[in-house]
């Protein structure tokens, strides 16, 4: 019961996490820039992984996509890649984990198969979460190190002057969504891996042993019957008794005078 709960909870937590990673990847507010020195209107500038937006205090908003790949900073491309890899791994992990759920019966799937699938999905969730956390952290590091501030008090060839507006980029909402979502996916993955241990059937091989009436020459040896767990000394299914007790295989293969009374 506890295993099923752990697995189910891991699945739900991972599902929420991956939904969050997708949301963060699509969001426009990865970085925000406030402008205060404008005599016309307050302008709020914010960027995502795919487009940049400008919102005026009047409510007018204009967004434009980054239609070039060559001009984009390598770090931005790396963040995009990390987030997409995270989403893809997470989506595959979700698909696998659905079939691995203990509460869902699919044909005659054994517990060992479900355990393996649970472990696979768990690992996928962990990697997915790490990708998201890494992507968001790389972007955050770019903001902290003022990566964007590349044009400051330069003169253009036309004789006009360009000045960077004295504002700084701050962390957008998408960064926090990404961190939390990545963390949830990671936790969900760990829970799936823990659930996998409970799902895996222990190797307790109780071999069928047939007992037959034997002659007076066979002495009963007390304490002879042992359940083979794979870790004891009786791992090869050897005869425990000298006389009439044999495994099914031995009975069929080697009939003796004592077998029939």
């Amino acid at each position: 019961m506890a295993v099923t709960a752990c697995q189910g909870l891991g699945f739900v937590v991972s599902l929420i996490g991956i939904a969050g990673i997708i949301a963060a990847t699509c969001m426009d507010q990865w970085s925000t820039q406030d402008l205060y020195n404008n005599p016309v209107t307050a302008v709020f500038n914010y960027q995502g992984l795919w487009r940049s937006c400008v919102r005026e205090s009047s409510g007018f908003t204009e967004c434009r996509g980054y239609f070039t790949l060559l001009g984009l900073p390598a770090m931005l491309q790396a963040v995009r890649a990390l987030m997409i890899v995270g989403i893809v791994l997470g989506a595959i992990g979700l698909l696998v984990s659905i079939f691995a759920l203990k509460c869902i019966r699919i044909g005659s799937m054994e517990d060992s198969a479900k355990a393996n699938m649970t472990l696979t999905s768990g690992i996928m969730f962990i990697v997915s979460g790490l990708c998201a956390i890494a992507g968001v952290s790389v972007f955050a590091n770019m903001l902290v190190t003022n990566f964007w501030m590349s044009t400051a008090n330069m003169y253009t060839g036309m004789g006009g002057m360009v000045q960077t507006v004295q504002t700084r980029y701050t962390f957008g909402a998408a960064l926090f969504v990404g961190w939390v979502a990545g963390g949830l996916t990671l936790i969900g993955g760990v829970m799936m891996c823990i659930a996998c241990r409970g799902l895996a059937p222990e190797e307790t091989n109780y071999k069928a042993v047939s007992y037959h009436a034997s002659g007076h020459s066979v002495a009963y040896k007390p304490g002879g019957f042992k359940a083979s767990t794979g870790f004891g000394s009786n791992t090869k299914n050897k005869k425990i008794y000298d006389g009439g007790a044999r495994t099914e295989d031995e009975v069929q293969s080697y009939p003796s005078k004592h077998d029939y009374v």
Epitope: R64, G71, Q163, T167
Partner: nanobody
């Protein structure tokens, strides 16, 4: 980069009219706000009028009712229609654009080289 070129300045009599224009060119990603400033000899640069892409406009008290700012978003051009000109309007008029040359760059203040407007009889 974004280049701004002003035109339309010149000598005009008091009470006359002039129309200034400022065209932005270059690697423009977005120009949310375009603004006109002026600087008279020996004075500080002051705000005249401006307009946002959304159509919000603002004017300095000294030019309200006389000047009109307009904008052609398709051409990335801002206009300043100046009527009932006075001698105190004599100055070098500068065009300013808050723009980004790339979407992932911060908005920057770009300035034109200025155009001279002289109001004299």
């Amino acid at each position: 980069q974004v280049q701004l070129v002003e035109s339309g300045g010149g000598l005009v009599q008091p009470g006359g009219s002039l129309r200034l224009s400022c065209a932005a060119s270059g690697s423009i990603f977005s120009i949310p706000v375009m603004t006109w400033y002026r600087q008279a000899l020996g004075k500080e640069r002051e705000f005249v009028a401006g307009i946002s892409k959304g159509g919000t406009s603002n004017y300095a008290d000294s030019v309200k009712g006389r000047f009109t700012v307009s904008r052609d978003n398709a051409k990335n051009t801002v206009y300043l229609q100046m009527n009932s000109l006075k001698s105190e309007d004599t100055a070098v008029y500068y065009c300013n654009a808050q723009a980004s040359s790339f979407g992932w760059m911060p908005l920057s203040d770009y300035w034109g080289q200025g155009t001279q407007v002289t109001v004299s009889s």
